[in-house]
């Protein structure tokens, strides 16, 4: 079952010794303890296959091996994102799929993996030394990226083995920052536990908030933390970058796609991909009473993570992606 990063509700301290400061020092260890326990190391794998029947056809498969909630997957090529990378496809588990030539047939395979077929000829054709990268945005891990390409000697019909951690590249600002905070927090937690070991343990009570509520927490953070979220991106390093794809991205467009960049070289800032759609908030959380998916039964072995989705303002059956409850 999924471990939710819920902080146990604490009984308010008795008036007197602890006071407000004491209450804060009691809450903080539990927050830090939860973060330390739930912190994991996610991975992204990428598999690239050249189809035997069509030498200009590639199948790219990407998967996420983390415990977080996947919000968006971006597949692209064309160099580092800040240096003219071109988005091939963007997949949202609930709000649909966008793909641009030469990409076709981008699909979710499972709740934690996607596939994409590339076909083309001439300027828009992929070639054997093209590197394809996939970036998964997840909460709380942040954005995680991996790249893959066919080995130079690959025969058509053979695929490169999935390439996980060796070329894993986290969104350094986010991940290192979170890692640093967690490391500091864990050290600080040990310090606090040592200081408080002679004190009686706080009494716990069940949380009075709806048990459903925290599951959508990735999608309605406070304004401050929401500003820190990134639209995921992925980059391609290739010597056969298509010359004709700069105009592949439509200007404007409906709903949450509207704010995607017209050129993938410009990294979106902030939560642009969902900024144009109002997200109903209830405090810092969003109610998921309208549905989404809940995991049924125990997770089978060797499966990827669950997904937590946007609560959809259009009503109870507007969801199409899964909500993983581990």
């Amino acid at each position: 079952m999924r471990t939710e990063a819920q902080v146990p509700a604490l009984q308010p301290p008795e008036p007197g010794l602890e006071g407000a400061m004491g209450h804060r020092t009691l809450v903080l260890p539990w927050v830090l303890l939860t973060l330390c326990v739930t912190a994991g190391t996610p991975e992204v794998w990428v598999q690239v296959r050249m189809e035997a029947t069509e030498l200009s056809s590639f199948t790219i498969r990407c998967g996420f091996l983390g415990s977080g909630s996947i919000s968006l997957v971006t597949v692209s090529w064309g160099g580092p994102n800040g240096a003219g990378g071109t988005t091939l496809a963007v997949l949202h588990p609930e709000r649909g799929i966008r793909q641009w030539a030469p990409a076709r047939q981008a699909r979710w395979e499972t709740q934690s993996s996607i596939s994409l077929i590339l076909e083309g000829s001439g300027a828009s054709s992929p070639c054997a030394n093209t590197t394809f990268c996939c970036k998964f945005a997840s909460f709380p891990e942040g954005s995680w990226e991996a790249c893959g390409s066919l080995p130079p000697s690959s025969d058509p019909g053979l695929s490169a083995p999935p390439t996980p951690a060796p070329i894993l590249r986290a969104d350094l600002a986010g991940i290192l920052g979170v890692s640093g905070v967690l490391l500091f927090g864990c050290v600080y937690l040990l310090h606090l536990l040592r200081r408080h070991k002679h004190r009686p343990a706080p009494r716990l009570q069940p949380s009075r908030t709806s048990p459903q509520a925290p599951r959508a927490r990735a999608w309605a953070p406070s304004q401050a933390s929401q500003a820190a979220l990134h639209v995921p991106y992925a980059t391609i390093n290739t010597s056969c970058r298509p010359a004709t794809l700069d105009t592949a991205h439509p200007h404007g467009g409906p709903s949450w796609w509207a704010s995607l960049p017209t050129h993938a070289a410009h990294r979106p800032q902030g939560p642009a991909a969902w900024a144009s759609t109002p997200i109903p908030a209830r405090g810092s959380f969003v109610s998921v009473e309208n549905g989404l998916y809940a995991q049924a039964g125990e997770r089978p072995p060797h499966t990827g993570p669950g997904l937590t989705l946007f609560p959809d303002p259009r009503g109870p059956r507007a969801m199409e992606g899964p909500l993983g409850v581990r």
Epitope: G96, E109, Q295
Partner: antibody, heavy 117, light 107 residues
Framework: EVQLQQSGPELVKPGASVKISCKAS????????MNWVRQSHGKSLEWIGD????????NYNQKFKGKATLTVDKSSKTADMELRSLTSEDSAVYYC??????????WGQGTLVTVSA | DIVMTQSHKFISTSVGDGVSITCQAS??????VAWYQQKPGQSPRLLLH???FRYSGVPDRFTGSGSGTDFTFTISTVQAEDLAVYYC?????????FGGGTKLEIK
Amino acid sequence: EVQLQQSGPELVKPGASVKISCKASGYTFTDYYMNWVRQSHGKSLEWIGDIYPNNGDTNYNQKFKGKATLTVDKSSKTADMELRSLTSEDSAVYYCIRGVGLGFPYWGQGTLVTVSA
Amino acid sequence: DIVMTQSHKFISTSVGDGVSITCQASQVVSTAVAWYQQKPGQSPRLLLHSASFRYSGVPDRFTGSGSGTDFTFTISTVQAEDLAVYYCQQHYRTPYTFGGGTKLEIK
């Protein structure tokens, strides 16, 4: 609310063609694959193929290549499937379905096609 | 194509009992299996996808498990309204394929 409204039942003669339509509403039509599935009487379900409305890209089950042709009209948010050279084996209920790959959550009500002389 | 096999065409059970339906894929499909319920005269209804993820509004008596090639769909406490045909489907690769269906009958 997502809705897929299919055209009414069809009675056609063997060798003829028929076009079934599916009008979508309640979502961004171009962002989701439109799948088509056939269910013969008392039998299981067969995936015919899908179309990506944003660019009209199609993917067919090999079994239905030459039998089915999928098209979309973005302006009217309508997906069509034309079936040709019909035989009695093609008598079935045909469904349009919206999806992204993770199963098929939204189904049309189905269109019954009866092929009979 | 990936062949999905539901070994039982019919399963008979009583209201209040539990029942499991199995589905086997002819090749590994990770966890990419969905389950549907179809009642007479209705379109199929998605219950689970990715082997074990319940769709919106699906009661929690419906559960699923499995990975690779063997999958199980379970109704923990059968109710009268569960009388239907249940289909498995692989959503791992196109062409997407369905099992032959298992009809749940109430004793």
